[in-house]
Interface confidence: low
């Protein structure tokens, strides 16, 4: 933070801050702890007060350090904790499978191990490993097919 | 320090096919998604094509869908938008950007691709 | 799909001036809304995310504010370096779309 001189005697930097000089300025380097010109203030993003994946952002309110949140898409308010209309309001995702938002009408459904599809309702076929010997499972209609290494063969490569 | 560099823009003749590459360096690549933007001779900023993470997630604007695919090597840090069919409005200064914050937080310097016959 | 409209699309302003850019949507956007800087060799820069906050390393005369369909990008004390041109861009539907640009230039 770019403050006073911090070298001179009251002006030095506390809780720890360090007093480094560059391009001909002084300026207190605080440790994660604390902020402002002198490191005098906590800082007041480790409480980590946004929530829902928001962004806490420190600043500087009438010379008080404060906080202001930047909401992750779907989510609006001075915490992030208004969930606006959006495509994962109404859990698309089945089988445990997580909703990402990509826009507030678009989703993408991240699915569990076994499972496949736009919102996790296939059950991936190739989830058991059934090809042995190194063969390469493709799903094929609602069962697989194996592609297999030089020398064997079969449905499942054996 | 974050750079984005494309590469593969020329002069094609219209029906004709272009391969544009995007070669990142100073972040981990993967963990970003990738947008492709286009800038047409009046100046105006078209999104073209999204992709996510793993490249298992694509999204298209409604005047390339079809004809235009993103990709991406994440081993090798780069974004790819293999354009076919191409037309004479397809003209443009294509420029490859990385998604942060729900933005595209840096954008390489961009590849000049001319339609014409 | 969302229009964005920069209904100025070129600017002159004095260096030291307060310069507001204005840009709207064709519906509400939720502060879904990005600003991006062209210098005029072609470098583009993100500016401004979610309406209000501040890319690293952007100077602190730039501000934007807005809500609803109406939004704006402030630059209060205009310096050389700022001669370019400002696009908005709105991310709650996809395709994602800009506003055609407002150049600013020096009086």
């Known amino acids: 933070a770019r403050g006073p001189r911090c070298s001179q005697p009251g002006e030095t930097c506390l809780n720890g801050g360090k007093c480094e000089a560059a391009n001909g300025t002084e300026a207190c380097v605080c440790g994660g702890a604390f902020v402002g010109p002198r490191c005098q203030d906590p800082n007041p993003c480790l409480s980590t007060p946004c929530k829902n994946a928001g962004t806490c952002h420190v600043v500087d309110r009438r010379g008080v350090a404060d906080y202001a949140c930047s909401c992750a898409l779907g989510f609006s308010g001075p915490l992030c904790l208004t969930p606006l209309d959006n495509a994962c309001l109404t859990n698309p995702c089945r089988n445990g499978g997580t909703c990402d938002l990509l826009t507030l009408t678009e989703y993408k459904c991240r699915c569990p191990p076994g499972w496949s599809g736009k919102s996790c309702q296939q059950a991936d076929p190739c989830a058991s490993n059934p090809c042995a010997n190194g063969g390469q499972c493709l799903p094929f209609e609602a069962s697989y097919i194996c592609h297999c290494p030089p020398s064997f063969h079969g449905p499942t490569c054996r | 320090e974050v750079n984005l560099v494309e590469s593969g823009g020329d002069l094609v003749q219209p029906g004709g096919s272009l391969r544009l590459s995007c070669a990142a360096s100073?972040?981990?690549?993967?963990?970003?998604?990738m947008s492709w933007v286009r800038q047409t001779p009046e100046k105006r900023l078209e999104w073209v094509a999204y992709i996510d993470y793993g490249g298992d997630f694509t999204s298209y604007s409604d005047a390339i869908r079809g004809r235009f695919t993103i990709s991406r090597d994440n081993a090798k840090n780069t974004l790819y938008l293999q354009m076919s069919s191409l037309k004479s409005e397809d003209t443009a200064i294509y420029y490859c950007?990385?998604?942060?914050?729900?933005?595209?937080?840096?954008w390489g310097q961009g590849t000049s691709v001319i339609v014409s016959s | 799909d969302i229009q964005m409209t920069q209904s100025t699309s070129s600017l002159s302003a004095s260096l030291g001036d307060r310069v507001t850019v204005s840009c709207s949507a064709s519906q509400a956007i939720s502060n879904y809304l990005n600003w991006y800087q062209q210098k005029p060799d072609g470098t583009l820069k993100l500016l401004i995310y979610y309406t209000t906050n501040l890319h690293s390393g952007v100077p602190s005369r730039f501000s934007g504010s807005g809500s609803g369909t109406d939004y704006s990008l402030t630059i209060s004390n205009l310096e050389p370096e700022d001669i370019a041109t400002y696009y908005c861009?709105?991310?709650?539907?996809?395709?994602?779309?800009f506003g055609g640009g407002t150049k600013l230039e020096i009086k």
């Open positions: 950007s990385r998604r942060r914050y729900d933005a595209m937080d840096y």
């Open positions: 100073g972040f981990t690549f993967s963990s970003y998604t």
């Open positions: 861009q709105q991310y709650s539907k996809f395709p994602w779309t």
